[in-house]
């Protein structure tokens, strides 16, 4: 698994809706693969973490002044939808095939 | 200034191109305001950090399993361009008014 010493990457994160109190309105699924972005944004930033120019600059400043400026952060740069069956405002079970922004598709350094 | 205990916000970060070794090709400016996103993404995530659904989910999982899952990260969510005078491949000083992605416009929790 990706620890603090490993490079920024997508790792598994199974989320159970009961654990986060969302089981009151999300009927299905009971759990899903959310993924998590873990690991460091170390110099030099590789192409696969799709760094912005600002992330590259911040990484270089961090190299020069590590106590003054933080590293760029490993975060989701692209998200995917999941299908959910949920209770709407009227309590009616409603199916949504594209409940956006729930699962990590790609991670990067920002 | 925004420390580890403060909420995610945009803070000043003056970058000198000589410090990062870019003065060999960026002629002007000598330095610029890059800004940095600093601070924590604490529960509950406020609207001003424009959290994605995944960031909200991850924050809730972190609350439940703080050692297993990290908090969302405070990162640039919108970047601005700066004007630069740089040496092109031919060594010709070239002015670009919109050198994209160099300065933070907005920070958020991702």
């Amino acid at each position: 698994s990706a620890g603090a010493g490993s490079h920024c990457q997508k790792t598994s994160l199974r989320v159970n809706f009961e654990d986060i109190g969302w089981d009151s309105w999300i009927i299905a699924p009971k759990e899903y693969e959310a993924y998590e972005c873990k690991g460091g944004c170390f110099f030099p930033l590789a192409d696969d973490v799709t760094p912005t120019k600002h992330a590259i600059v911040q990484t270089l400043v961090h190299l020069k002044f590590p106590t003054k400026v933080g590293k760029a952060c490993c975060v989701p740069t692209k998200l995917s939808p999941i299908s959910v069956l949920y209770k709407d405002d009227m309590g009616v079970p409603t199916l949504k095939y594209h409940y956006e922004g729930m699962s990590v598709a790609e991670c990067g350094c920002r | 200034s925004a420390g580890a205990g403060s909420h995610c916000q945009k803070t000043s970060l003056r970058v000198n191109f000589e410090d990062i070794g870019w003065d060999s090709w960026i002629i002007a400016p000598k330095e610029y305001e890059a800004y940095e996103c600093k601070g924590g993404c604490f529960f509950p995530l406020a609207d001003d950090v424009t959290p994605t659904k995944h960031a909200i989910v991850q924050t809730l999982v972190h609350l439940k399993f703080p050692t297993k899952v990290g908090k969302a990260c405070c990162v640039p969510t919108k970047l601005s361009p700066i004007s630069v005078l740089y040496k092109d491949d031919m060594g010709v000083p070239t002015l670009k008014y919109h050198y994209e992605g160099m300065s933070v416009a907005e920070c958020g929790c991702r």
Partner: antibody
């Protein structure tokens, strides 16, 4: 060598339009913005605007907005500056200049007279 | 627009003199400043870019300094071919502006 060659002198009546051309050679035309600058007799330099030859997007000085049009023909490495609704105060030498003003055309005298 | 103010507007000097022309911007322009020389009937010629960088082919007697709002063009030892009009120019803002010019004449 790198050079910009402009079209010849023009005499125009007030209210007319003029179109000045600037042909680039010795470098890749699309690599650099093209600026236009004018200079009235005995006066200083006045920037009019620039065109990015790649997309053709322009940035005009506020003073000339609505009267100036900058275009380009990449197939012949030529930039154009058209100024409409001419007045006597537009009598000037018009220059094209590459991106960072390191290379200038020889200038085109435009005389506006009735 | 950013105003560029040159001083003096004209000066008389002799061959061999050290000449200094100043340029002040109405707001900070970092080092986005250029200096040009113009002779009668000719197009301007770039001398200095980014406040202090000498353009290729320009004699080393020309130098530039400054940052922010105050800038200087110095000719260390005036030569006969240096009698001309000199302009400063800011390129910081997308609306580019020139100074009004400084005429360097023979004393």
């Amino acid at each position: 060598q790198v050079q910009l060659v402009q079209s010849g002198a023009e005499v125009k009546k007030p209210g007319a339009s003029v179109k000045v051309s600037c042909k680039a050679s010795g470098y890749t035309f699309t690599s650099y913005y093209m600026n236009w600058v004018r200079q009235a007799p005995g006066q200083g330099l006045e920037w009019m605007g620039w065109i990015n030859p790649v997309q053709g997007n322009t940035n005009y000085a506020q003073k000339f907005q609505g009267r100036v049009t900058m275009t380009r023909d990449t197939s012949i490495s030529t930039a154009y500056m058209e100024l409409s609704r001419l007045r006597s105060e537009d009598t000037a030498v018009y220059y094209c200049a590459r991106n960072y003003f390191d290379v200038w055309g020889q200038g085109t005298l435009v005389t506006v007279s009735s | 627009d950013i105003q560029m103010t040159q001083s003096p507007s004209s000066l008389s000097a002799s061959v061999g003199d050290r000449v200094t022309i100043t340029c002040r911007a109405s707001q900070t322009i970092s080092n986005f400043l250029a200096w040009y020389q113009q002779k009668p009937g000719k197009a301007p010629k770039l001398l200095i870019y980014a406040a202090s960088n000498l353009q290729s082919g320009v004699p080393s007697r020309f130098s530039g300094s400054g940052s922010g709002t105050d800038f200087t063009l110095t000719i260390s030892s005036l030569q006969p071919e240096d009698f001309a009009v000199y302009y400063c120019q800011q390129l910081y803002a997308e609306s580019i502006t020139f100074g009004q010019g400084t005429k360097v004449e023979i004393k």
